[in-house]
């Protein structure tokens, strides 16, 4: 099920999904002067089975030539929920995230893609926060947020992160060990949440990445 709102905004911080849960949609947006091809997909959809997840549909842009406005993707009524804008300063594919069951990795860029990516997140999605360049992370707890639900009501948890204006950069998703690191989430046959192992994988992945790798900025 789709999350109703955007992940929380933390002053002087950006967030990133390490991987995208099945059901996540990414709008097919084109940069100025281009538009989706006729009968092209409105969005890419993360789908899969228990063993493999991937993005369905391909986004394709073509020159709008006679048009000078970019066609905006309007999700269907049931999709008009989470519209998270993400700036793609230099589109890239992060380190392999295929090890997370039920999740898709960052979709590769497509030709003439817009500079912003609009994701529609689903319940159970986790995002990780880091302070922007020039700010240092102070943690009261995990620098992460989860979209949770009870019977149709969705909400993102509040990440325990404060960014202070010291000229230091921090590793993603946070260089300082949280006081209370997230416990493993129970595993079950179709559990959508990141388990302890998954979290360790993600933390290890993050630790091996240089800050400069995160060129996908989440505003």
């Amino acid at each position: 099920e789709l999350c109703d709102d955007d992940p929380p905004e933390i002053p002087h911080a950006t967030f990133k999904a390490m991987a995208y849960k099945e059901g996540t949609m990414l709008n097919c947006e084109c940069k100025r002067g281009f538009r989706r091809i006729k009968s092209g997909s409105l969005y890419m959809l993360c789908t899969g089975n228990s063993s493999h997840s991937s993005w369905d549909n391909q986004c394709q842009c073509t020159s709008s030539a006679t048009r000078n406005t970019t066609k905006q993707v309007t999700p269907q009524p049931e999709e008009q929920k989470e519209r998270k804008t993400t700036e793609m300063q230099s589109p890239m594919q992060p380190v392999d995230q295929a090890s997370l069951p039920g999740h898709c990795r960052e979709p590769p860029p497509w030709e003439n893609e817009a500079t912003e990516r609009i994701y529609h997140f689903v319940v159970g999605q986790m995002v990780y926060y880091q302070c922007v360049q020039g700010y240092r992370a102070l943690h009261r707890g995990p620098a992460e947020s989860v979209c949770k639900m009870t019977h149709g009501k969705t909400r993102w948890t509040q990440p325990q992160l404060i960014c202070t204006g010291e000229m230091e950069t921090s590793q993603f998703p946070g260089e300082e060990k949280p006081q209370a690191s997230p416990e493993g989430r129970p595993e079950s046959e179709t559990s959508c949440l990141v388990t302890t192992t998954d979290f360790q994988i993600q933390t290890e992945m993050a630790a091996t990445m240089e800050t400069s790798i995160f060129t996908t900025e989440y505003q």
Epitope: V123, G124, G152, K153, G184, R185, P186, T190, S191, C192
Partner: antibody, heavy 121, light 112 residues
Framework: QAYLQQSGAELVRSGASVKLSCTAS????????IHWVKQRPEQGLEWIGW????????EYAPKFQGKATMTADTSSNTAHLQLSSLTSEDTAVYYC??????????????WGQGTLVTVSA | DVVLTQTPLSLPVSLGDQASISCRSS???????????LEWYLQKPGQSPKLLIY???NRFSGVPDRFSGSGSGTDFTLKISKVEAEDLGVYYC?????????FGGGTKLEIK
């Protein structure tokens, strides 16, 4: 594995208050909504309310407003239910349960074992 | 409040028989997001309830396929194709689409 451990049985006097606890293991309560359910002896289930442990937001069934108070302590991964001005009508087993969600499922997948509250005259 | 009426109150069956329990709501329980949060729980004597079916017709992980849920709007049914001894207990329907969420009165499945 997810598990909810509830506090032991309580025998309390009429007019008094009682505070029940529900401690989660295997998951972080702040990432879920914790619900409380009442079951009187030989009767059905009644929904009391839910709490969002992350921010303390609560929702109560009208019937339990003023009677029940839900709180949570994320540092101990524990949810609490306080019942006030107890009467014989409050004699019941009280369950905590977590609304669990997966890729395609959602419901009260995990329950505590229940706490029996007996109100004596 | 949404009232859920379960019938029958008691259902005597022979092992191996099919059992059918009805749950009728006083109003439509389609949530504003289009989902119907209708669930079925089984409570065995001396135990906590267990989730069987969520969103009308979906079996929860580990629930045998002899259990099936169906219905829409205000009429819902839980069917057990071949009753086994371990299925005995009280079955409750539950709706979470409207606040406050409510349980049905329960149906006791017992041996004939």
């Amino acid at each position: 594995q997810a598990y909810l451990q509830q506090s032991g049985a309580e025998l309390v006097r009429s007019g008094a208050s009682v505070k029940l606890s529900c401690t989660a293991s295997g998951f972080n309560i702040k990432d879920y909504y914790i619900h409380w359910v009442k079951q009187r002896p030989e009767q059905g289930l009644e929904w009391i309310g839910w709490i969002d442990p992350d921010n303390g937001e609560t929702e109560y069934a009208p019937k339990f407003q003023g009677k029940a108070t839900m709180t949570a302590d994320t540092s101990s991964n524990t949810a609490h239910l306080q019942l006030s001005s107890l009467t014989s009508e409050d004699t019941a087993v009280y369950y905590c349960t977590v609304f669990w969600y997966g890729n395609n499922y959602a419901g009260f997948a995990y329950w505590g074992q229940g706490t029996l509250v007996t109100v004596s005259a | 409040d949404v009232v859920l009426t379960q019938t029958p109150l008691s259902l005597p069956v022979s092992l191996g028989d099919q059992a059918s329990i009805s749950c009728r709501s006083s109003q439509s329980i389609v949530h504003s997001n289009g989902n119907t949060y209708l669930e079925w729980y089984l409570q065995k004597p001396g135990q906590s309830p267990k989730l069987l079916i969520y969103k009308v017709s979906n079996r929860f992980s580990g629930v045998p396929d002899r259990f099936s849920g169906s219905g829409s709007g205000t009429d819902f049914t839980l069917k057990i194709s071949k009753v086994e001894a371990e299925d005995l207990g009280v079955y409750y329907c539950f709706q979470g689409s409207h606040v406050p969420p409510t349980f049905g009165g329960g149906t006791k499945l017992e041996i004939k």
